[in-house]
C-alpha cells in the first residue's frame, strides 16, 4: 500500500494496490482519484495529472465512487400504478413502488417493475393471508360457524351471531338472523384474526378448496398460476 | 511541510471575520483543504472544502454562514455574520485528493481561536 | 445525509488493557473509514485510513476493521501515551452532510 501522504497520480508499489477511493488507470500505469457520487469522469488520468470530474447531467446519475465516462440514465417515470417513492437525484436512480391496493408482481434490483392489483376474496371466503408488498392475498373458503359478506382484500371470515331464538341459519356469506333478544358473538373454531396488510404485492398462487374429506373440513393447494381461483375476483 | 492557520480573535456578534491558512513546504496545486472547528470541550466538526478548482463543498449547517476560498498558496475562511455558537478553534487540513468529499486528512494547523462575544 | 455515530462517548481502560471504540454510518460508506486522536490542546493525528490501514508512524496496537455501515478502532496492550480522545470521520459523501466526524471517544487509562 502506499504511504499515506501519496498524491494522486502515483504509481503503485511493485505488487501494491491503489486505496478505495483510487483505481489503477492502465494507461497512465497510476493510481488515479475515482470520482465521487453524483460526478462522473470528464477528464481520465495521465502520468501528470490527476482525473478530472464533472456532475452528472439531468435526469442521470452514479451512485458509487466511480471512472465512468457516462453517468447512468435514471429509469422512466413511474407508471399509474406505481408511487415515486426515490426521485432521481445526481445520486440515486428513480424508485418506483406499487400503490396501496397492489403488489409487486416483477420485482427489479430496486423497486418494481410490474404491479398487480390485490386480489378479492368474494363473499363465502376470507382472507387466509394478507397481501405484502411481494405477495397476493390468499382467499379460504369461510370454514362453519364463520361467514364473509363482502368482496375484500382484507377482510377475514368472521364468527356468526349467537341466537338465542334463531330467524334464519348463518352460512358462508351471510350471518345468521336472531329474532327479539340481543345476540352475541361466538369465536367459532376457525375464526382467525389477521392483521391488516402491510401494503399490497408478488407470485399468482392462488389458492383452491380441495373436495371435502370431512364435515367443516377443507383444505387449501397452492396452484402454479391459472385463471382467478374460486374465492377471489378477478383483477 | 506545514499548515498554519492566522485571523483569530475577539469579535463582536455579526462581524464578518476571515481566517487565512498558509502552506508552506508543498504546493497547494494537488490536494484539497478543509476547514474544520471545534467548540470548547466538543467534538471536531466539518465546516467545508474547497479544491484546486476553486469548487467548494459545505457541511449544510455552514451554508452561506461561512465561505472558502483560495489563491496559490492560501485558502481563506470567512464567517459572514458570526454568532457566539461559533466560538471556537479553526484548524485548516490538507486533503490527500483533490476532491470535494473528504477522504482523509493527513496534516492539521495548530488551530486559531476564534471568540464571538457582545 | 451520512451520519456518524460514535460509541461510547467515554471508555476507562488500565494500562495493558483493550479498548473498542465503535463508529456507526447510517447509510454504506464503503470502508471509506479514517481515525484520528487528539490529545488535549493539540492538532488531531490520522492514525488509520481505509478501515484498516496504519498511517506511517502509528504502533500496531492500533487497528481498524469494519465494513458497510459499522467500523471499530481497536487498542491493544493500551499505553499512558494513548489517553485521548478519538474520532472517526467518512470519506464516502459531501452531499447533505451535517459532519463528516463522529461525536467522539475519550479514552482514560488508569
Known amino acids: 500500500l502506499p504511504a499515506q501522504v501519496a498524491f494522486t497520480p502515483y504509481a503503485p508499489e511493485p505488487g501494491g494496490t491503489c486505496r478505495l477511493r483510487e483505481y489503477y488507470d492502465q494507461t497512465a500505469q497510476m493510481c488515479c482519484s475515482k470520482c465521487p457520487p453524483g460526478q462522473h469522469a470528464k477528464v481520465f488520468c495521465t502520468k501528470t495529472s490527476d482525473t478530472v470530474c464533472d456532475s452528472c447531467e439531468d435526469s442521470t446519475y452514479t451512485q458509487l465512487w466511480n471512472w465512468v465516462p457516462e453517468c447512468l440514465s435514471c429509469g422512466s417515470r413511474c407508471s399509474s400504478d406505481q408511487v415515486e417513492t426515490q426521485a432521481c437525484t445526481r445520486e440515486q436512480n428513480r424508485i418506483c413502488t406499487c400503490r396501496p391496493g397492489w403488489y409487486c408482481a416483477l420485482s427489479k434490483q430496486e423497486g418494481c417493475r410490474l404491479c398487480a392489483q390485490l386480489r378479492k376474496c368474494r363473499p363465502g371466503f376470507g382472507v387466509a393471508r394478507p397481501g405484502t408488498e411481494t405477495s397476493d392475498v390468499v382467499c379460504k373458503p369461510c370454514a362453519p360457524g364463520t361467514f364473509s359478506n363482502t368482496t375484500s382484500s382484507t377482510d377475514i371470515c368472521r364468527p356468526h351471531q349467537i341466537c338465542h331464538v334463531v330467524a334464519i341459519p348463518g352460512n358462508a356469506s351471510m350471518d345468521a338472523v336472531c329474532t327479539s333478544t340481543s345476540p352475541t358473538r361466538s369465536m367459532a373454531p376457525g375464526a382467525v384474526h389477521l392483521p391488516q396488510p402491510v401494503s399490497t404485492r408478488s407470485q399468482h398462487t392462488q389458492p383452491t378448496p380441495a373436495p371435502s374429506t370431512a364435515p367443516g373440513t377443507s383444505f387449501l393447494l397452492p396452484v402454479g398460476p391459472s385463471p382467478p381461483a374460486e374465492g377471489s375476483t378477478g383483477d | 511541510q506545514s499548515v498554519e492557520e492566522s485571523g483569530g480573535r475577539l469579535v463582536t456578534p455579526g462581524t464578518p471575520l476571515t481566517l487565512t491558512c498558509t502552506v508552506s513546504?508543498?504546493?497547494?496545486?494537488?490536494?484539497?483543504i478543509s476547514w474544520v472547528r471545534q467548540a470548547p470541550g466538543k467534538g471536531l466538526e466539518w465546516i467545508g472544502i474547497?479544491?484546486?478548482?476553486?469548487n467548494t463543498a459545505y457541511a449544510t449547517w455552514a451554508k452561506g454562514r461561512f465561505s472558502i476560498s483560495r489563491t496559490s498558496t492560501t485558502v481563506d475562511l470567512k464567517i459572514t455574520s458570526p454568532a457566539t455558537k461559533d466560538t471556537a478553534t479553526y484548524f485548516c487540513?490538507?486533503?490527500?485528493?483533490?476532491?470535494?468529499?473528504?477522504?482523509?486528512?493527513?496534516?492539521w494547523g495548530q488551530g486559531t481561536l476564534v471568540t464571538v462575544s457582545s | 445525509a451520512y451520519d456518524m455515530t460514535q460509541t461510547p462517548a467515554t471508555v476507562e481502560v488500565a494500562v495493558g488493557g483493550t479498548v473498542t471504540i465503535n463508529c456507526q454510518a447510517s447509510?454504506?460508506?464503503?470502508?471509506?473509514l479514517a481515525w484520528y486522536q487528539q490529545k488535549p490542546g493539540q492538532r488531531p493525528k490520522l492514525l488509520i485510513y481505509?478501515?484498516?490501514d496504519l498511517a506511517s508512524g502509528v504502533p500496531s496496537r492500533f487497528s481498524g476493521s469494519g465494513s458497510g455501515t459499522e467500523y471499530t478502532l481497536t487498542i491493544t496492550g493500551v499505553e499512558c501515551a494513548d489517553a485521548a480522545t478519538y474520532y472517526c470521520q467518512q470519506g464516502y459523501s459531501s452531499s447533505n452532510i451535517d459532519n463528516v466526524f463522529g461525536g467522539g471517544t475519550e479514552v482514560v487509562v488508569k
Open positions: 474547497i479544491n484546486t478548482y476553486d
Open positions: 481505509d478501515t484498516s
Open positions: 513546504g508543498f504546493s497547494l496545486s494537488s490536494n484539497a
Open positions: 487540513a490538507r486533503d490527500v485528493h483533490n476532491n470535494v468529499v473528504p477522504y482523509y486528512f493527513d496534516m
Open positions: 447509510q454504506s460508506i464503503s470502508n471509506l
